[in-house]
């Protein structure tokens, strides 16, 4: 366990990784390939009509810690799931939209009368 | 030091197969990609396809699709190259080389293989 | 393909003499999320295989004499011998890994006078 206020840098990989892409290919991915040196992620967020929408890619090492953390965002249905133990490991991260809380329907962007 | 130890040489018939071999040392087989060079005499350089030994997860370049598959002994720490249908188009010096960033920091000798009746 | 083109193919040289040689690609080799250049080069002497000089477009592998220098960015790339020695006759290479497949430029062969 890290002590308080002590930051270590991530580990870089002694070598790239390839993930599946799906919404979130970068400019140099192949047949919905992409390459890092940190990890593969999976996300199932709400778009703004409240449909799951899932996207796959490929994080770099640099604040992929913090992203893959899956802090929870107010008013913001999301979960993202990182993987790295193998080539397009993402593949098999099926993340869940975490369940709706009564305050999410009163404190959400629109208000039901 | 790291060495990528290949055979010389490869006399094969037109139209037969054969397994080329690259016996790695020197390193930890599984912390690198290995990749296949082709060079056809007084020729550049083209890339065939790699392999991750961790996983045995490969790509290929289009253009040697269903001529080349990659494979990997863990125990023996040897990446081999099978070619399939040779023809004379196929004589040329293989390399393996191995990657951790898709840049080809140790290179084998090179096998020269010839495709002769 | 990403198509690498390499001149002049060849050019002969004293040593002492300071040598360029060019290699420009059909589209970029910077990728966006890092500013790196997805570039390497490759010296091949007679009867040789190829050796790693110069990553990421600028970086020299570790063990390669500080007279080779790579630059350039985008889609032109050049690699510099400041003061060439009788040893460096060879061809020498291009590659581009920033998208699958790899492929590499035609080659300059230095001679030397």
């Known amino acids: 366990k890290k002590e308080d206020g002590e930051s270590t840098a991530p580990t870089p990989r002694p070598k790239v990784l390839r993930c599946k892409c799906h919404h979130h290919c970068p400019e140099d991915s192949v047949n919905n390939i992409c390459s890092t040196d940190g990890y593969c992620f999976t996300m199932i967020e709400e778009d703004d009509s409240g449909l799951p929408v899932v996207t796959s890619g490929c994080l770099g090492l640099e604040g992929s810690d913090f992203q893959c953390r899956d802090t929870p965002i107010p008013h913001q249905r999301r979960s993202i799931e990182c993987c790295t133990e193998r080539n397009e490991c993402n593949k098999d991260l099926h993340p869940t939209l975490p369940p709706l809380k009564n305050r999410d329907f009163v404190d959400g962007p629109i208000h039901h009368r | 030091q790291v060495q990528l130890q290949q055979p010389g040489a490869e006399l094969v018939m037109p139209g037969a197969s054969v397994k080329l071999s690259c016996k790695a040392s020197?390193?930890?087989?599984?912390?690198?990609?290995m990749h296949w060079v082709k060079q056809r005499p007084g020729q550049g350089l083209e890339w065939i396809g790699d392999?991750?030994?961790?996983?045995?997860?490969?790509n290929y370049n289009h253009k040697f699709k269903g001529k080349a598959t990659l494979t990997v002994d863990k125990s023996s720490s040897t990446a081999y190259m099978q070619l399939s249908s040779l023809t004379s188009e196929d004589s040329a010096v293989y390399y393996c080389a191995r990657s951790g960033w898709d840049y080809f920091d140790s290179w084998g000798q090179g096998t020269t293989l010839t495709v002769s009746s | 393909d990403i198509v690498m083109t390499q001149s002049p193919s060849s050019l002969a040289m004293s040593v002492g003499q300071k040598v360029t040689m060019s290699c420009k690609s059909s589209?970029?080799?910077?990728?966006?999320?890092?500013?790196?250049?997805?570039l390497a080069w490759y010296q091949q002497k007679p009867g040789q295989s190829p050796k790693l000089l110069v990553y990421?477009?600028?970086t020299r592998e570790s063990g390669v004499p500080d007279r080779f220098i790579g630059s350039g960015s985008g889609t032109d790339f050049t690699l510099t011998i400041s003061s060439v020695q009788a040893e460096d006759l060879a061809d020498y290479f291009c590659?581009?890994?920033?998208?699958?497949?790899?492929?590499f430029g035609g080659g300059t062969k230095l001679e030397i006078k």
């Open positions: 590659q581009q890994y920033y998208r699958i497949p790899w492929t």
């Open positions: 392999i991750d030994p961790s996983d045995t997860y490969t």
């Open positions: 020197g390193y930890t087989l599984t912390n690198y990609w």
């Open positions: 589209q970029s080799l910077l990728k966006s999320s890092n500013q790196k250049n997805y």
């Open positions: 990421f477009a600028s």
